[in-house]
């Protein structure tokens, strides 16, 4: 699977269950790990900090003792466990630690992990709420007039709304500059689309729309392949055995595999 | 201890400067103020630190105007770029200098960086189709005000358009819809008191002009035996290729 660095992670859990939030800070020799919660429209607030050397959680005043627990599966790895979830536990959870980069001062700055969105809901959803892709290939008008082509990747019927999309050429790890619409609610699920405009010289390359979502099959990034487009003048081959529908639209079945 | 960011949101064009205000209350005599940038992905990135006993902090395009007596610590971002669009948080740090210290945050100010004022530019309009799905792609226009209409007699559903800033600092937009008669759907756009149609951009081609998916050796290619050199699609239908994943 491709590696979407940093950024969007989500965990969806029903009420009264537990959730695990993994800290993605790669800090060696951290003495304390702090846990913050940010809920939309509010100020981020610290919930607790974990004393690494004494393996002890220190909660902010007013928080119930059994609610939060920091688990350390191995050295320099931390997981926040939340118990007895309620909908109001929903929000973005961050781990953080002080980076004393400048020895002349007591501390320099607080570094935050990339954040995990916790969604606590009892909504009854379909068994499969992974993003369902539909692809759009460039219009011939665009490729002819503008010497460029736009690929569009539509993703529908996913839950929760936390999703990350990026684009790459087939044999490259370089993330290409793309654009996307806001995530839109449709009934109880969400849809989003992203598009990539490439110059004419790149139309003969295969492109990939790479999607990270909590409910992707096997937990790996979903890769949607956009085939290369050849825009030269050629002749039809009557022996071509590709099936076409009545509208002469070529139908291809793309296997959903991820490296 | 309290931090107040009164501006919930602010908009400013590229190249200009924006100042984000932050007031705080503290009984500590010595402390630090931190500014963070929260990306749309929710990542929280440290920008700059202001010490209560230090000169105004400056780091690249970020500068702090610190007034200790007024308990005010304003962040100025100069020479704004489109990538500066984000939510900015002001945070007060405990004075202890200990690794257990917490940050007290404000509610944040959302900064939206807009394109600069520039000449009005007429959009290009293209239609892309896949099965019942139709997308109207509207490229490189200014100003932002636009009405996009997918013209069809058999609408199933339509979505609000996405209007975003293009890399060139103009606007791009996409409007999606589902239609029973997708083959006949066209797109018309009202912009700057003029109407532009997708049909204005259609290329008249003869029947020998085709576009095909290029031969490729990728193992993730379609399972049908269609991705060999002879898999050919009519040019005018290239954007109707349906890949069902």
């Amino acid at each position: 699977s491709s590696n979407l660095e940093g950024g969007t992670k989500s965990v969806t859990r029903p009420t009264r269950s537990s959730a695990e939030i993994t800290c993605d800070l790669t800090v060696i020799n951290a003495f304390y790990i702090h846990w913050y919660l940010h809920q939309e429209g509010k100020a981020p607030q610290r919930l607790l900090y974990y004393d690494v050397s004494n393996s002890k959680d220190v909660l902010e005043s007013g928080l119930s003792p059994g609610k939060y627990y920091t688990h350390t599966p191995r050295r320099w790895s931390w997981i926040l466990i939340l118990r007895n979830l309620i909908e109001n536990d929903s929000g973005v959870y961050y781990c953080a630690t002080w980076d004393r980069g400048n020895p002349k001062t007591h501390y320099y700055k607080k570094l935050f992990g990339s954040g995990t969105t916790l969604v606590v809901t009892d909504k009854q959803l379909d068994a499969d709420v992974s993003p369902k892709p539909t692809i759009f290939l460039p219009s011939i008008a665009e490729t002819k007039l503008q010497k460029a082509g736009t690929y569009l990747c539509l993703l529908e019927k996913f839950f929760p709304d936390v999703i990350k999309i990026h684009w790459q050429e087939k044999k490259s790890n370089t993330i290409l500059g793309s654009q996307e619409g806001n995530t839109m609610k449709t009934n109880d699920t969400y849809m989003k689309f992203s598009w990539l405009t490439v110059p004419e010289k790149s139309l003969d390359k295969e492109h990939r729309c790479i999607v990270r979502h909590e409910n992707n099959k096997n937990g790996v990034d979903q890769e949607i392949i956009f085939p290369p487009i050849k825009t030269d003048v050629i002749t039809m081959d009557p022996k071509d055995n590709c099936s076409k529908d009545a509208n002469d639209t070529l139908l291809l079945q793309l296997t959903n595999t991820s490296a | 201890q309290k931090v107040t960011q009164a501006q919930s949101s602010v908009s400013m064009p590229v190249r200009k400067a924006v100042t984000l205000n932050c007031l705080y209350e503290t009984s500590w005599w010595s402390y630090y103020i931190f500014w963070y940038k929260q990306l749309p992905s929710k990542e929280m990135i440290f920008l700059i630190r202001q010490g209560s006993d230090e000169q105004n902090a400056k780091s690249g395009r970020y500068s702090v105007n610190f007034k200790k007596a007024a308990k005010s610590v304003a962040l100025t971002i100069s020479a704004l770029q489109l990538e500066d669009s984000a939510k900015y948080f002001c945070a007060l740090g405990d004075p202890g200098g200990l690794n257990t210290d917490k940050l007290i945050f404000g509610k944040g100010t959302r900064v939206t960086v807009e394109p600069r004022s520039q000449p009005h530019t007429k959009p290009s309009v293209f239609v892309m189709k896949n099965g019942t799905n139709v997308a109207c792609l509207v490229k490189e226009f200014y100003p932002k005000d636009i009405r996009i209409n997918l013209v069809s007699s058999k609408k199933i559903t339509e979505f609000d358009p996405a209007i975003v800033i293009s890399p060139s600092g103009k606007y791009n937009a996409v409007k999606l819809g589902k239609y029973e008669d997708s083959n006949s759907v066209t797109c018309s756009v009202q912009h700057d008191n003029k109407t532009v149609h997708s049909t204005d951009f259609e290329v008249k081609t003869d029947s020998t002009d085709h576009v095909k998916p290029k031969e490729t050796e990728n193992t993730k290619q379609p399972s049908k035996s269609c991705h060999k050199p002879k898999a050919i699609v009519h040019t005018e239908k290239v954007n109707m290729m349906s890949l069902t994943v």
Epitope: - | R15, K16, A79, S117, P119, T121, Y142, S168
Partner: antibody, heavy 121, light 112 residues
Framework: QVQLQQSGPQLVKPGASVKLSCKAS????????INWVKQRPGQGLEWIGW????????DYNGKFKGKATLTVDTSSSSAYMELHSLTSEDSAVYFC??????????????WGQGTSVTVSS | DVVMTQTPLTLSVTVGQPASISCKSS???????????LNWLLQRPGQSPKLLIY???KLESGVPDRFSGSGSGTDFKLKISRVEAEDLGVYYC?????????CGAGTKLELK
């Protein structure tokens, strides 16, 4: 005072390319667009495009896309225009001009002295 | 593209007399920000163009106040209250409201 100093006259062969320069002084180079304008002998002014030295973004008159490439070197406060695949139609005087922000006046307030390009075999 | 039509193409005047040049655009030059980006330039013989007036009527610094600009929408005028010898040359109206920027063909001001 604000000045735009352009490179000297050029005699070039058809099919070749030529790169014209425009050195700015007397103001903050990265804060204003640099425009390029074409004037054929005895003719009017034709806008080619502009570049913003602050970030290198460009915008071209569609007629000159592929014909002209605009670049800047902020270290020397210089703007450049390269003209490709030259023909006799490209014989002209080319001006660079500073343009202020659209929030101010959006006007080309200072002009270079012009560079004459003659395309001839 | 927006077409800028200047009249007259040539204007013969006597020093000390007034002069007026008209410029019409094929569409309104009112920008969405409320401003009208219509400039007047003067190109003296053998020289580069020089900005006289911007935003229809604003005089560029250093330009004598005998020059004035007026108009709105699609109709614009440049007036010289009393022509002087140094005013001779070709006057261009230039619009910067619509992309691409376009100029009129020019009006040649000459002495009678």
């Amino acid at each position: 005072q604000v000045q735009l100093q352009q490179s000297g006259p050029q005699l070039v062969k058809p099919g070749a390319s030529v790169k014209l320069s425009c050195k700015a002084s007397g103001y903050t180079f990265t804060s204003y667009d640099i425009n390029w304008v074409k004037q054929r002998p005895g003719q009017g002014l034709e806008w080619i495009g502009w570049i913003y030295p602050g970030d290198g973004t460009t915008d071209y008159n569609g007629k000159f896309k592929g014909k002209a490439t605009l670049t800047v070197d902020t270290s020397s406060s210089s703007a450049y225009m390269e003209l490709h695949s030259l023909t006799s139609e490209d014989s002209a005087v080319y001006f660079c001009a500073r343009m202020d922000d659209y929030d101010d006046g959006g006007a080309m307030d200072y002009w270079g002295q012009g560079t004459s390009v003659t395309v001839s075999s | 593209d927006v077409v800028m039509t200047q009249t007259p193409l040539t204007l013969s005047v006597t020093v000390g007399q007034p002069a007026s040049i008209s410029c019409k655009s094929s569409q309104s030059l009112l920008h969405s920000n409320g401003k009208t980006y219509l400039n007047w330039l003067l190109q003296r013989p053998g020289q580069s163009p020089k900005l006289l007036i911007y935003l229809v009527s604003k005089l560029e610094s250093g330009v004598p106040d005998r020059f004035s600009g007026s108009g709105s929408g699609t109709d614009f005028k440049l007036k010289i209250s009393r022509v002087e010898a140094e005013d001779l040359g070709v006057y261009y109206c230039l619009q910067a409201t619509h992309f691409p920027l376009t100029c009129g063909a020019g009006t040649k001001l000459e002495l009678k």
